[in-house]
């Protein structure tokens, strides 16, 4: 299953499959997730080691048993790959690192006014993988405001150095935020020239294209079909690059297919997995296990559940079958692709779905009225769980926020439905940033069921929580995916990085905002909160957040929206915007429904009809 816990001051011994430099443990974990054989990783921050060569070292590891011995190492951080973690699998990494210079091949230098502008330039440059920006206070005046666009053979920095007044980060192309746009066409009987960066075997051009998309240096590809004249080159997928970023020439060639990486697509990228099953095809590779199962789909599920399995072949040969069950060969290779592809066989083959980010039809947990005042504009994909709950009577308007917690589930505040319990009047918009982008043609979700907490009473602040079951499940994308829930009764975690988001009023007597707002707000203890609200009972099922001096808060129209906190690199839904005395008033924190206290209720209500809890636990 999915394991998300990080081990501090611990280093996994042995099992090394690759090493690289990364700016933090989360980026190291992402590289492990996308490496075909990596199950575990260890990261050495600059503070953890004197050896300059090993600072920022990210060590990717494999293990036949799925685990390795941990040794104590002060400052080291270790953890697991996020393979099998559904919607948490993403190559998108937005963080900007202050005080570090990520080294690589500098191929473009320009003057820009901010690090965000530098990141945007990198994202809009086809070859840029990461960048460094010298701030206005950089010690050498001639380098100030310099934006250096960079690449490297592996897509990660060739070195990382601590350097004051320098900020570094990665291209946001994997976040589907590139302005370049992409070529979706696949060209038959055409071969591209230029530099081959890798060679893998694939069953069709679509798998070849997906592998190209997620390869750090592939910009385009040529695939040799299963009837290519040279037998040894059949099913070869050549991943390619060029100085210009486009093929310098193409040659008409029977039984070849060429196309482009989809990394520069805007708003949608292919999933980093291959779900199709190929009848009449055998995939060769290193044998991991052989098991008898009923049907090729069960074989694929078996492969997906066995974390080291990369691909499989389900044999229909009479000698491989007993009654209704046949042999399911679970296999792997060094690069994650078959070492041999044979056609015209009595097998069916396919790939593990361990990197599919759609996950199952579940809500996500982890084991470990009231707009935003004093906030700033959010950007695309920053809060992909945020939804807008709108009511369509004669006109249509935004009333509340909500949080996507599963393909078919939204968590919000019960008081949003005061006087409006009819599910037909509600429209739920997900994957949006600007309310003004909503037109009559914008897709929305309708409500199948509104589940208000049984102990909620109108005009009381208690149990202000409601679940919405959508009529149809939503697909996950970089702009529309769920927030993980905390574990039941989560009281031990100290959250220091919490944000509230919404389209609500920007002042007490204001109006709904167009662009989704965000504000960073500290949590306040319940004791402190109770002192500020002596006329109300602040229960253990509430959580408060706000600045003593006021000025930043949720407000009308934010109700039902998320209070999220980042812990160990993962966002969790800590609270649901519920109530407060006015908005952003001095010594009047906002009050939120404490989600951890309602986990049993959420799990009970989101159980599927067959009684199986629709939960996906990354721990």
């Amino acid at each position: 299953g999915c394991l998300t816990q990080l081990y501090e001051n611990a280093f996994f011994r042995g099992g090394d499959v690759a090493s690289m430099y990364t700016p933090n443990a989360q980026y190291c974990q992402m590289r492990c997730t996308f490496h075909p054989r990596c199950l575990l990783f260890s990261f050495l921050p600059a503070s953890s080691i004197n050896d300059m060569e090993k600072r920022f070292g990210c060590f990717l590891k494999d293990s036949v048993t799925g685990t390795l011995p941990k040794v104590h190492r002060t400052g080291a951080v270790s953890g697991h790959s996020l393979k099998q973690c559904g919607h948490q699998i993403s190559a998108c990494h937005r963080d900007i690192y202050k005080g570090v210079d990520m080294r690589g091949v500098n191929f473009n230098v320009s003057k820009v006014s901010s690090v965000e502008e530098c990141q945007k330039r990198c994202t809009s440059n086809i070859r840029c993988q990461f960048f460094s920006y010298a701030t206005q206070t950089f010690h050498k005046a001639e380098y100030r405001n310099n934006c250096l666009l960079k690449y490297s053979p592996g897509g990660t920095p060739t070195a990382i150095k601590v350097l004051s007044n320098v900020e570094s980060g990665f291209s946001l192309k994997p976040c589907a935020l590139s302005e370049i746009g992409c070529h979706m066409n696949i060209f038959q009987h055409l071969a591209f020239s230029d530099v081959d960066v890798a060679r893998v075997l694939t069953p069709d051009a679509f798998v070849c294209r997906t592998i190209c998309t997620y390869h750090p240096n592939c910009l385009f590809f040529t695939f040799y079909t299963n009837v290519w004249k040279i037998e040894s080159q059949r099913n070869v997928c050549l991943l390619k690059t060029s100085e210009s970023g486009t093929p310098s020439s193409s040659t008409p060639q029977e039984n070849t297919i060429s196309g482009y990486s989809l990394l520069t697509c805007k708003r949608t990228l292919p999933e980093p997995c291959h779900s199709k099953i190929y009848p009449g095809v055998d995939f060769g590779g290193e044998e991991l296990n052989v098991t008898f199962v009923k049907g090729v789909n069960v074989c694929q599920e078996t492969c997906t559940k066995m974390i080291r399995c990369q691909f499989f072949t389900y044999s229909l040969l009479p000698e491989d079958c007993k009654e209704e069950k046949c042999k399911c060969f679970l296999r792997l290779s060094m690069d994650g692709s078959p070492t041999r592809i044979a056609y015209g066989t009595q097998g069916s083959s396919g790939y593990s779905l361990r990197l599919c980010n759609t996950g199952d039809n579940s809500v996500c947990t982890t084991k470990t009225s009231t707009r935003i005042v004093g906030g700033t504009n959010s950007s695309w994909g920053e809060w992909p769980w945020q939804v807008s709950l709108q009511v369509k009577l004669t006109a249509q308007r935004h009333l509340c926020g909500g949080s996507l917690i599963g393909h078919q589930w939204v968590l919000t505040a019960a008081h949003c439905f005061d006087g409006l319990p009819l599910q037909d009047v509600w429209r739920i918009y997900s994957g949006i940033l600007n309310l003004s982008d909503i037109t009559k043609d914008t897709p929305f979700s309708q409500i199948k069921e509104i589940i208000i907490h049984q102990n909620y009473k109108v005009s009381e602040g208690n149990h202000d929580i409601a679940l919405i079951k959508l009529q149809a499940p939503l697909n996950y994308t970089e702009f529309q995916k769920p927030i993980c829930l905390p574990s039941k009764g989560d009281t031990s975690t100290i959250y220091t990085n919490c944000w509230v988001t919404g389209w609500g009023f920007s002042k007490e007597k204001g109006e709904i905002q167009n662009i989704l707002q965000k504000v960073n707000i500290p949590l306040v203890t319940n004791e402190e909160c109770q002192k500020r609200y002596q006329d109300y009972k602040i229960t253990q099922r509430m959580v408060c957040a706000g600045y003593k001096e006021g000025g930043k808060d949720a407000c009308k129209g934010d109700s039902g929206g998320p209070l999220v906190c980042k812990h160990n690199g993962m966002w969790r839904l800590v609270g649901i915007t519920s109530w407060g005395e006015g908005c952003a008033r001095r010594e009047q924190p906002g009050v939120y429904t404490k989600v951890a206290e309602y986990m049993d209720w959420i799990l009970e209500k989101t159980q599927s009809s067959d009684g199986k809890a629709q939960m996906q636990s990354p721990a």
Partner: antibody
């Protein structure tokens, strides 16, 4: 020239049997998975059956499972569909089709079709 | 089985008009979606494979887009020879299924 040519259609009574053939030419037949697709008069396309290149694996639409059998003879470059226990709703034009596998099972080669009428 | 829906079921447009047909699948199929054109009394003809790639020999006025569950076939400038019925088909998982079809006529 790549070609598929169906034959064997005709009028048959409910409960009767019929065997359709599809002769392939112009390509290496044994490399390709083959399909039967049908179309009832005035209606849409319905996938009927599929056979692996080797003939070792087959698949059927629920509507024909247990009554129809797909087979192939790679030495004769021919695909077959044995249809038993025919019903009025099996009345359709039957097409054989194949996919140049690397197009992801898009059917880029089709026959001209053969008409099967089930009526008393 | 993967269910397919197509809209509209029929349309009538003038020569030179842009025509759009949509296809929706009951589950995600990546880009394993194909479009066919069928003229009366003829076998279907592959137009677009892999959601967006033009089959060789097909005029460039035909284009396809989409991934996951929502797909579109666009004819940028309708010609008299484009009259016929258009079908989408998923080739992601067996049984392969077709949409119910969209009949295109010229006004």
């Amino acid at each position: 020239e790549v070609q598929l040519l169906e034959s064997g259609g005709g009028l048959v009574q409910p409960g009767g049997s019929l065997r359709l053939s599809c002769a392939a030419s112009g390509f290496t037949f044994s490399w390709y998975p083959m399909q039967w697709v049908r179309q009832a008069p005035g209606k849409g396309l319905e996938w009927v059956s599929y056979i692996y290149p080797s003939g070792g694996g087959t698949d059927y639409a629920d509507s024909v499972k247990g009554r129809f059998t797909i087979s192939r003879d790679n030495s004769k470059n021919t695909l077959y569909l044995q249809m038993n226990s025919l019903r009025a709703e099996d009345t359709a034009t039957y097409y054989c089709a194949t996919s140049s596998g690397w197009l992801g099972d898009a059917f880029d080669i089709w026959g001209q079709g053969t008409m099967v009428t089930v009526s008393s | 089985d993967i269910q397919m829906t197509q809209s509209p079921s029929s349309l009538s447009a003038s020569e030179g008009d842009m025509v759009t047909i949509t296809c929706r699948t009951s589950r995600r199929i990546g880009t394993y979606l194909n479009w066919y054109q069928q003229k009366p009394g003829k076998a279907p003809k592959l137009l677009i494979y892999g959601a967006s790639s033009l089959q060789s020999g097909v005029p460039s006025r035909f284009s396809g887009s989409g991934s996951g569950t929502d797909f579109t076939l666009t004819v940028s400038s309708l010609q008299p020879e484009d009259v016929g019925t258009y079908y989408c088909q998923q080739s992601f998982s067996s049984p392969w299924t077709f949409g119910p079809g969209t009949k295109v006529e010229i006004k």
